[in-house]
Interface confidence: medium
């Protein structure tokens, strides 16, 4: 299996530093993947014009992202630790089918594709460690996410484009309500 | 462009470490494979550290084979208890060896002999 | 992770067609990450397909490259003397591992 990073791999940048606390580890993998995003948003962008299409909220009804809700504890009000925990971790893991839609979806940045997917594995396991209610965690049917996976793959072209386009703006909001909220724990 | 060295004669049993220096591109944009080849033989991948420094080596290359990013341009390649089997031509390669943007270094020769 | 290369061996005169067929133990990465490449002695190799069925930059449209999960094929349509060289498949597999199938030869008479 992989080795993530900040385990036995080495830090290059500074590699005199201090070991980097959980938190720390977690914050850094976060800004990682978001900068993993913006690099795959700016093909998509480049490629369609789906950042400026109005036809958005059409398709995203049809794909049921995970999203941040009040009642998840998550936002500054009513904020709840271990509630918000499990959201999280919850909605990377119902995040990961569409990851592995996103493998086959670029070109230029395939590379940057397959890092953010298992720059996420290595997050999700970070928080796990984290979590204490492990039981609250519900995992996605390996079946359920195969036939959605087909599904997304037998769409048409314009379909496909937009489908990109509408993973990356969630798991990048997702990203970001998550930061947030893991920097107030 | 990538480019291998470190490549020499060693005697069995000993180390070796081989760099591979990347031109034009840093190592934040694009991982890097290291694939061998014996004399007149196939080709055989073993490992590659991803731009999310994630390493993945072959089964048979884990425990003796260290795949290392050592600054923003360079890997190294990381051999121990070598024996004349390991003799081989070893490649440097940008990117996984499936991905489009692959490019391959000339190659620097290992010889385990005694 | 194994893939097979079919066949070891194959002579084509010019203008023939040739096909080389690469089988995986496994379903490769997301069924599609196999690529094709070509080398010729004293080379590094030199990518000609990838995703399957891609063709790379600056190689001729007479290489081609179908399948997908286990079974792969290479066709090179219109054998020319320049095709005569060793022929590798090469995945990926879940973790990102790799694999290089045993090598084709391929001889133009």
């Known amino acids: 299996a992989p080795v993530p990073p900040g385990e036995d791999s080495k830090d290059v940048a500074a590699p005199h530093r201090q070991p980097l606390t959980s938190s720390e580890r977690i914050d850094k993998q976060i800004r990682y993947i978001l900068d993993g995003i913006s690099a795959l948003r700016k093909e998509t962008c480049n490629k369609s014009n789906m950042c400026e299409s109005s036809k958005e909220a059409l398709a995203e009804n049809n794909l049921n992202l995970p999203k941040m809700a009040e009642k998840d504890g998550c936002f500054q009000s009513g904020f709840n630790e271990e509630t918000c925990l499990v959201k999280i971790i919850t909605g990377l893991l119902e995040f990961e089918v569409y990851l592995e839609y996103l493998q086959n979806r670029f070109e230029s940045s395939e590379e940057q594709a397959r890092a953010v997917q298992m720059s996420t594995k290595v997050l999700i396991q970070f928080l796990q460690k984290k979590a204490k209610n492990l039981d609250a965690i519900t995992t996605p049917d390996p079946t359920t996410n195969a036939s959605l996976l087909t599904k997304l793959q037998a769409q048409n072209q314009w379909l496909q484009d937009m489908t990109t386009h509408l993973i990356l703006r969630s798991f990048k909001e997702f990203l970001q309500s998550s930061l947030r909220a893991l920097r107030q724990m | 462009s990538v480019e291998e060295s470190g490549g020499r004669l060693v005697a069995p049993g000993g180390s070796l470490t081989l760099t591979c220096k990347a031109s034009?591109?840093?190592?934040?944009?694009?991982?890097v494979s290291w694939v061998r080849q014996a004399p007149g033989k196939g080709l055989e991948w073993i490992g590659y550290v991803s731009i999310a420094d994630t390493i993945s080596y072959a089964n048979w290359a884990k425990g003796r084979f260290t795949i290392s990013k050592t600054s923003s341009t360079t890997v190294d390649l990381e051999m121990t208890s070598l024996t004349t089997e390991d003799t081989a031509t070893y490649f440097c390669?940008?990117?996984?060896?499936?991905?489009?943007?692959?490019?391959w270094g000339p190659g620097t020769l290992v010889t385990v002999s005694s | 992770q194994v893939l097979t290369q079919t066949p070891a061996s194959v002579s084509a005169a010019v203008g023939g067609t040739v096909t080389i067929s690469c089988q995986s133990s496994?379903?490769?990465?997301?069924?599609?990450?196999l690529s094709w490449y070509q080398q010729k002695p004293g080379q590094p190799p030199k990518l000609l397909i990838y995703?399957?069925?891609k063709l790379a930059s600056g190689v001729p449209s007479r290489f081609s490259g179908s399948g997908s999960g286990t079974q792969f094929t290479l066709t090179i349509s219109g054998v020319q003397c320049d095709d005569a060289a060793t022929y590798y498949c090469a995945g990926e597999y879940e973790g990102g591992i790799g694999t290089f199938g045993g090598g084709t030869e391929v001889v133009v008479v």
């Open positions: 995703k399957a069925s």
């Open positions: 034009g591109f840093s190592l934040s944009s694009s991982g």
């Open positions: 496994q379903n490769v990465y997301s069924n599609a990450f």
């Open positions: 390669v940008r990117g996984f060896i499936t991905y489009s943007g692959v490019l």
